[in-house]
Interface confidence: low
């Protein structure tokens, strides 16, 4: 949606021109505008930026093409024929009319817009081979940009790790994206919200279908980027969902309390070889470095396809798999380390944490082993494995007591 920016315009350093796929003068008339307003406009990624003049570095408005529906040629009111200089951009929630100086300019704008939203060069427009070549170059740039583009709240964590992060750092947000655990070329969204006095964790599947991401909800919703996926969740919950941004100060190692086998005391356990943590999120898409140290880690042995199955609640509740199903956010038997605590050794007697809580029990045992992420882990594998074993043991003991 076109939105005037509130902050004062801070010009970029002189000489640093915005890098646009295409730019020209463009007159724009939004749904609330009475007349066309002339801008210098530039297309970059899935956004058209509008400037007061072609000498400006700071845009005054921007228009996101994430909700693109179609482009149509426009015959101005009162005209009997198409002068070739008007076109309409139809987005899911609004229509914006544009006026340009020439037919060639109109076809160029339509061509570049279609190139970025449909990831193809539209050869059916009135364009010259040179224009098509320019669009093919933009297409290559846009495909490369999309391949690297990930929102700040995308973390390479498993389902369990995502849940733990949202529980541990509620002040950092309550929505995160993570790789799809079923090995499919998609992502999953994990959210945590208060519902009837209980924190509820929900998981949603987002399927990758070509260049689109389709959110698997009752009315499947397609988006052109992961950022648009995040926007969908934020806007459809009236901003109750906040993208998760992990501050640099937060610990990247999951520690937990374990009973010392010799003296029965509770001790702090932090695995000695910390796994790579998520990079501190600074807001805005950040490229994933293709050959980061994260990628060089030996891959974890793949588990049988269990990542995306819920831990089966005990009792009559069926095993659930996704889509708008709720899981009460359990207080896992994990004490999370306070902020800024120096990294303790593997065994540290009585760290400054509260007493070990009793696990909130789902009236029974775990239906299946808790999974370990197939992506690079946020938390050390050893720690998770121990925690999983610990959970399993505790719940089995409880089950035995109950029967």
């Amino acid at each position: 949606m076109a939105s005037a920016l509130r902050p004062p315009r801070v010009p970029k350093p002189k000489g640093v021109l915005p890098s646009h796929y295409y730019e020209s003068f463009l007159e724009k008339k939004g749904p609330c505008d009475r007349d066309y307003k002339k801008f210098w406009a530039g297309l970059q990624g899935l956004t058209i930026y509008f400037y007061n003049s072609n000498r400006d570095f700071q845009h005054v408005e921007k228009l996101n093409l994430g909700a693109f529906e179609k482009l149509t040629d426009e015959i101005p009111w009162g005209s009997s024929r198409d002068p070739g200089t008007h076109f309409s951009l139809i987005l899911r929630d609004q229509e914006i009319k544009f006026k340009v100086e020439t037919l060639e300019c109109r076809e160029m704008w339509k061509g570049f817009i279609l190139t970025v939203v449909e990831l193809r060069v539209p050869t059916d427009l009135t364009l010259l081979p040179g224009h098509l070549y320019m669009m093919s170059e933009v297409l290559a740039k846009e495909e490369a940009r999309r391949a690297l583009e990930t929102p700040s709240c995308f973390l390479k964590v498993s389902r369990l790790e995502a849940q733990l992060l949202l529980e541990r750092y509620p002040e950092c947000g309550n929505l995160l994206l993570r790789p799809s655990g079923d090995g499919a070329d998609g992502v999953s969204v994990t959210t945590r919200q208060m519902h009837n006095g209980t924190h509820v964790v929900r998981h949603y599947k987002v399927k990758r279908e070509g260049p689109k991401y389709v959110i698997d909800v009752e009315q499947p919703f397609s988006c052109t980027s992961l950022d648009a996926v995040v926007n969908y969740f934020v806007s459809h919950t009236k901003k109750a969902l906040v993208p998760f941004l992990l501050d640099e100060d937060y610990e990247k190692v999951l520690g937990y309390v374990e009973a010392d086998k010799e003296n029965g005391e509770n001790v702090w356990v932090a695995p000695s070889a910390p796994g790579p943590g998520p990079a501190p999120c600074t807001g805005g898409p950040k490229p994933l470095s293709p050959a980061s140290s994260q990628d060089k880690l030996p891959p974890l042995p793949p588990l049988p396809n269990q990542e995306e199955n819920y831990v089966t609640p005990i009792g009559d509740g069926p095993a659930v798999d996704y889509e708008n199903q709720d899981v009460a956010s359990s207080s896992w038997p994990v004490i999370l380390k306070p902020k800024k605590l120096p990294k303790p050794p593997a065994k540290l007697p009585k760290p400054p944490v509260g007493p070990k809580p009793e696990p909130k029990v789902f009236n029974g045992g775990l239906g299946r082993k808790l999974p370990v992420s197939s992506a690079q882990p946020l938390f050390p594998t050893a720690g998770l494995a121990d925690m999983t074993a610990e959970l399993q043991k505790k719940l089995e003991k409880r089950r035995a007591l109950e029967h």
Epitope: L114, E118, L119, R120, V121, P122, T123, D124, P129, L132, M135, S136, L139, A140, E143, A144, R146, A147, E209, G210, P211, K212, V214, S222
Partner: antibody, heavy 117, light 109 residues
Framework: EVQLLESGGGLVQPGGSLRLSCAAS????????MYWVRQAPGKGLEWVSS????????YYADSVKGRFTISRDNSKNTLYLQMNSLRAEDTAVYYC??????????WGQGTLVTVSS | DIQMTQSPSSLSASVGDRVTITCRAS??????LNWYQQKPGKAPKLLIY???SLQSGVPSRFSGSGSGTDFTLTISSLQPEDFATYYC???????????FGQGTKLEIK
């Protein structure tokens, strides 16, 4: 004149592999997504796979997922379909097609793949 | 996945007849629907795209209508060369995912 010419079909045993090629001429090959569509003898059309203009995005029908791989070489104006672990039900005429703004506007004449022991 | 159901699966008609073939999508596909004609041993030929737009070079006796889930292909006055199999095809999620109807075989009565 627009032309799409498929090749690489033939007789293969179940479990075997074949690589189909589709040579394009007469249009801007890099400018559009490409497809493979197949038609089993006496049956209807079945979409098999798609690839985006630059080759970054690929998509497959469930029936071939994990066995077939679509790719393209824009410098050679050629589309490929690598078919592994072939089954009897993959027997069909395979067409390559190219999309316009709303349509598959160009089709090849097809190449026959027969999977039989 | 979106399913496309064509009816009837076969149809006998005479030259000069008006013929209607319908296609139903399992969910709304707006007007992202194409109609193809296929003759034995040949590649499919596009007749109608975007539900109602006539592909260039296609005779005006062919027309398409509908949007959402229900679509129709009409041949206003059958000609001998129109006896063939007709397929509808959805193109909903942009460029990459297509589903065809099972086809309608149009035969001479």
């Amino acid at each position: 004149e627009v032309q799409l010419l498929e090749s690489g079909g033939g007789l293969v045993q179940p479990g075997g592999s074949l690589r189909l090629s589709c040579a394009a001429s007469g249009f801007t090959f890099y400018g559009g997504s490409m497809y493979w569509v197949r038609q089993a003898p006496g049956k209807g059309l079945e979409w098999v796979s798609s690839i985006s203009s630059g080759g970054s995005y690929t998509y497959y029908a469930d029936s071939v997922k994990g066995r077939f791989t679509i790719s393209r070489d824009n410098s050679k104006n050629t589309l490929y379909l690598q078919m592994n672990s072939l089954r009897a039900e993959d027997t069909a005429v395979y067409y390559c097609a190219r999309v316009g703004y709303d349509t598959m506007d160009y089709w090849g004449q097809g190449t026959l793949v027969t999977v039989s022991s | 996945d979106i399913q496309m159901t064509q009816s009837p699966s076969s149809l006998s008609a005479s030259v000069g007849d008006r013929v209607t073939i319908t296609c139903r999508a399992s969910q709304s596909i707006s007007s992202y629907l194409n109609w193809y004609q296929q003759k034995p041993g040949k590649a499919p030929k596009l007749l109608i795209y975007a539900a109602s737009s006539l592909q260039s070079g296609v005779p005006s006796r062919f027309s398409g209508s509908g949007s959402g889930t229900d679509f129709t292909l009409t041949i206003s006055s059958l000609q001998p060369e129109d006896f063939a199999t007709y397929y509808c095809q959805q193109r909903w999620y942009w460029w990459y995912l297509f589903t065809f109807g099972q086809g309608t075989k149009l035969e001479i009565k």
